[in-house]
Amino acid sequence: ESGYAQNGDLEDAELDDYSFSCYSQLEVNGSQHSLTCAFEDPDVNITNLEFEICGALVEVKCLNFRKLQEIYFIETKKFLLIGKSNICVKVGEKSLTCKKIDLTTIVKPEAPFDLSVVYREGANDFVVTFNTSHLQKKYVKVLMHDVAYRQEKDENKWTHVNLSSTKLTLLQRKLQPAAMYEIKVRSIPDHYFKGFWSEWSPSYYFRTPEINNSSGEMDPI
């Protein structure tokens, strides 16, 4: 059912570097999982190239990826999630390069959302909360989160805090007074599943209060 490349095309193809990377997202759309692959070399001519996954699937032997500009994508319920699948780059019926991958080891969680920071005057601290869609999932439920914050003027001076819950307390005395801060959070699988950091959540910006001279405490905004 597939077309065949002409010999010249294949000879050219064999000279190229077809190394690729993939990540999976489980229960990303209801009960559907997704798998996204892309070539590591952005200059690869992808015109006749297709991706295919075979093995460790439910009721099918293989699945074809859809091409979305530079990325290749599958959304399906048919990942078995036990054992390794073989992912191949193909020209027609010929495989150019393949990788055996367990989809549970290349999981990229969805980005956290609803990040917010509330100042507690009496406690002299900031309560950071955020949400994650993974609390409702059957598979990738347990995540490690990386909260990163910086003073807005310090371009690359991020402070990172790792936590497993979705709530963090920042002590006021650890922050500069009367300063604008940027904070963001990302997640990575932390139990059974392995993989990659999610995208960062949208940043949240908050200002620390001024120091109240009489008590040495910061003023709330």
Epitope: E1, V60, K61, C62, L63, N64, R66, K77, K78
Partner: antibody, heavy 117, light 107 residues
Framework: EVQLQQSGAELVKPGASVKLSCTVS????????IHWVKQRPEQGLEWIGR????????KYDPKFQGKATLTADTSSNTAYLQLSSLTSEDTAVYYC??????????WGQGTTLTVSS | ETTVTQSPASLSMAMGEKVTIRCMTS??????MNWYQQKPGEPPKLLIS???TLRPGVPSRFSSSGYSTDFFFTIEYMLSEDVADYFC?????????FGAGTKLELR
């Protein structure tokens, strides 16, 4: 070239059994699922079941459980459908079909089974 | 089990007319709907596979659309060679289930 070659027409008596064959070429039967579909004259298509020849794992539509038995012989690249306790309701064309991807792509030419005394 | 309801049962169309067939499913099957053409004495032929993907060699006048539970198959303009039975098949879950078919005739 992918082909599924089915055995010839059968005329059998009620109560008897019959075994239909489907020999594939152009691919390894272990790399596919083989599905079986029933089509009665002027009626729709009915899914009977499927076999994974690599593992002999089978699944049946509950309607055909006990009526149909699916087997495969990987050495001859052949799948079989056995139908038992035949009645006139089993008179139909039976197709074997390949499923590699998320669709049934190549179909055999069909075997006509007539159950009559 | 996912029930597939296909309509209409028959259609009589003039040459060049647009043909539309609908299949509805009793459960959400995402985009796992396939469309087949069958001519007398022949096995079914796959025209469009899941994800509304036109199979190689199938004329571009054939197309499909739909997602979840509601699916449409279209022949943009009817030709005499399109006289046949058409049916849909869901491959989302077992047992696989077919639509009852649409007999397309030339008026």
């Amino acid at each position: 070239e992918v082909q599924l070659q089915q055995s010839g027409a059968e005329l059998v008596k009620p109560g008897a059994s019959v075994k239909l064959s489907c020999t594939v070429s152009g691919f390894n039967i272990k790399d596919t699922y083989i599905h079986w579909v029933k089509q009665r004259p002027e009626q729709g298509l009915e899914w009977i079941g499927r076999i994974d020849p690599a593992s002999d794992d089978t699944k049946y539509d509950p309607k055909f459980q006990g009526k149909a038995t699916l087997t495969a012989d990987t050495s001859s690249n052949t799948a079989y459908l056995q139908l038992s306790s035949l009645t006139s309701e089993d008179t139909a064309v039976y197709y074997c079909v390949r499923r590699v991807y998320d669709y049934l792509d190549y179909w055999g030419q069909g075997t006509t089974l007539t159950v009559s005394s | 089990e996912t029930t597939v309801t296909q309509s209409p049962a028959s259609l009589s169309m003039a040459m060049g007319e647009k043909v539309t067939i609908r299949c509805m499913t009793s459960t959400d099957i995402n985009d796992d709907m396939n469309w087949y053409q069958q001519k007398p004495g022949e096995p079914p032929k796959l025209l469009i596979s899941e994800g509304n993907t036109l199979r190689p060699g199938v004329p571009s006048r054939f197309s499909s659309s739909g997602y979840s539970t509601d699916f449409f198959f279209t022949i943009e303009y009817m030709l005499s060679e399109d006289v046949a039975d058409y049916f849909c098949l869901q491959t989302d879950n077992l047992p696989l289930t077919f639509g009852a078919g649409t007999k397309l005739e030339l008026r």
